[in-house]
């Protein structure tokens, strides 16, 4: 006999990287008929929802109106049907951004390179942090972690046209508190026509919504804006 129900999906809207003082909603999707959902934060009960009527609802939302460092951390949810509880969801890492300072992102030898050239990004932040994150905008997110006292190097190696796109970096004060994003750096890689057609540039988002490509989600949930990429989430673990 089944002792637990399948785990729910958990994700953040609009995304798991939340600028300080902005709002975010944590969503938990279980099953129709669930009489109770519980949201846990860093291992402690955070909130409870008892849907009405339960047979018409399979998803609940937990609202955070004012993101800050106290709200950043790991969230999970569970649900109950009758007396039977589900497995806990995967962990959702909620990150607060726009903390303290803004790093500077530069690229060597420059933003316009030829396919096959070696390219290195440099992220610099003078305040006390030793971890840096380089993010490439687009539907398939590319995240690298780097370390250094005030600057981290991100060698991309010999680039292809697949490396084309817009990059930003963050300083990370801890796993869940990141700096302001750097100004964007657009990398233009020129190559032959055949390579270009094989490796089109990732679709990018307008500058004011650049973070939405890094939604924290899980496969199986049909949502247009849900981009099933765990790269950044896994980096936090």
């Amino acid at each position: 006999q089944q002792q637990t129900l399948p785990k729910p999906f958990i994700w953040a809207e609009p995304h798991f990287m939340v600028p300080k003082e902005k709002q975010v909603t944590i969503c938990c999707q279980g099953n129709y008929g669930a009489v109770e959902y519980q949201l846990h934060f860093e291992g402690s009960l955070f909130a409870v929802d008892r849907p009405k009527p339960p047979e018409r609802i399979n998803k609940v939302q937990f609202y955070i109106p004012d993101m800050n460092s106290r709200m950043a951390g790991q969230y999970s949810c569970i649900y109950r049907v009758g007396e039977l509880w589900s497995e806990p969801s995967n962990l959702l890492d909620l990150v607060v951004t726009e903390m303290y300072d803004t790093p500077t992102l530069s690229v060597h030898p420059g933003p316009e390179v030829i396919s096959g050239e070696k390219v290195t990004f440099y992220c610099r932040l003078d305040t006390a942090t030793s971890m840096f994150l380089l993010l490439k905008e687009g539907r398939s997110s590319h995240v690298q972690r780097g370390y250094g006292k005030v600057q981290a190097e991100f060698p991309l190696g010999p680039v292809t046209t697949a490396h084309r796109g817009t990059y930003r970096c963050f300083g990370s004060y801890n796993n869940h508190a990141w700096s302001f994003p750097s100004e964007p750096v657009k990398l233009l890689v020129t190559g032959d026509i055949e390579n270009t057609s094989l490796a089109p540039e990732d679709p990018t988002f307008p500058a004011d919504t650049w973070g939405t490509y890094l939604l924290t989600t899980e496969t199986g949930l049909q949502k247009d804006h849900a981009l099933w990429d765990h790269t950044a989430q896994n980096l936090l673990r």
Partner: nanobody, 127 residues
Framework: QVQLVESGGGLVQAGGSLRLSCAAS????????MGWFRQAPGKERDFVAA????????YYADSVKGRFTISRVNAKNTVYLQMNSVNPGDTAVYYC????????????????????WGQGTQVTVSS
């Protein structure tokens, strides 16, 4: 912006009853989930009870379940904590808190989930 003012605290004998009130000023009281927390000297602030913006559901700490009742009257912008069968372990400063929720069936248990706090009212239970 919501301002919260607690009242009703005082000295009560073990086994007795007390009703705490929390009056909210500001708009949209009915949109806020409300909670009561307590803090004994030298200890952390502990969850006591919470109520959703609609008044149902409610949620209680195990230590007060069956003894305390939380309720609200949105027309009066007030939330109440009825405390029965009190014991010396209930001695603490009691705080009222308010937090916005996405749904009217959500109760908030963790203090981080509340944006607004009252100044507190002292409850002392003598044996």
């Amino acid at each position: 912006q919501v301002q919260l003012v607690e009242s009703g605290g005082g000295l009560v004998q073990a086994g007795g009853s007390l009703r705490l009130s929390c009056a909210a000023s500001g708009r949209s009281f009915s949109r806020y989930a409300m909670g009561w927390f307590r803090q004994a000297p030298g200890k952390e602030r502990d969850f006591v009870a919470a109520i959703s913006s609609s008044g149902d559901p409610t949620y209680y700490a195990d230590s007060v379940k069956g003894r305390f009742t939380i309720s609200r009257v949105n027309a009066k912008n007030t939330v109440y904590l009825q405390m029965n069968s009190v014991n010396p372990g209930d001695t603490a400063v009691y705080y009222c808190a308010a937090g916005l929720t996405a749904r009217d069936t959500t109760v908030v248990v963790h203090p981080n989930g509340y944006s607004y706090w009252g100044q507190g009212t002292q409850v002392t239970v003598s044996s």
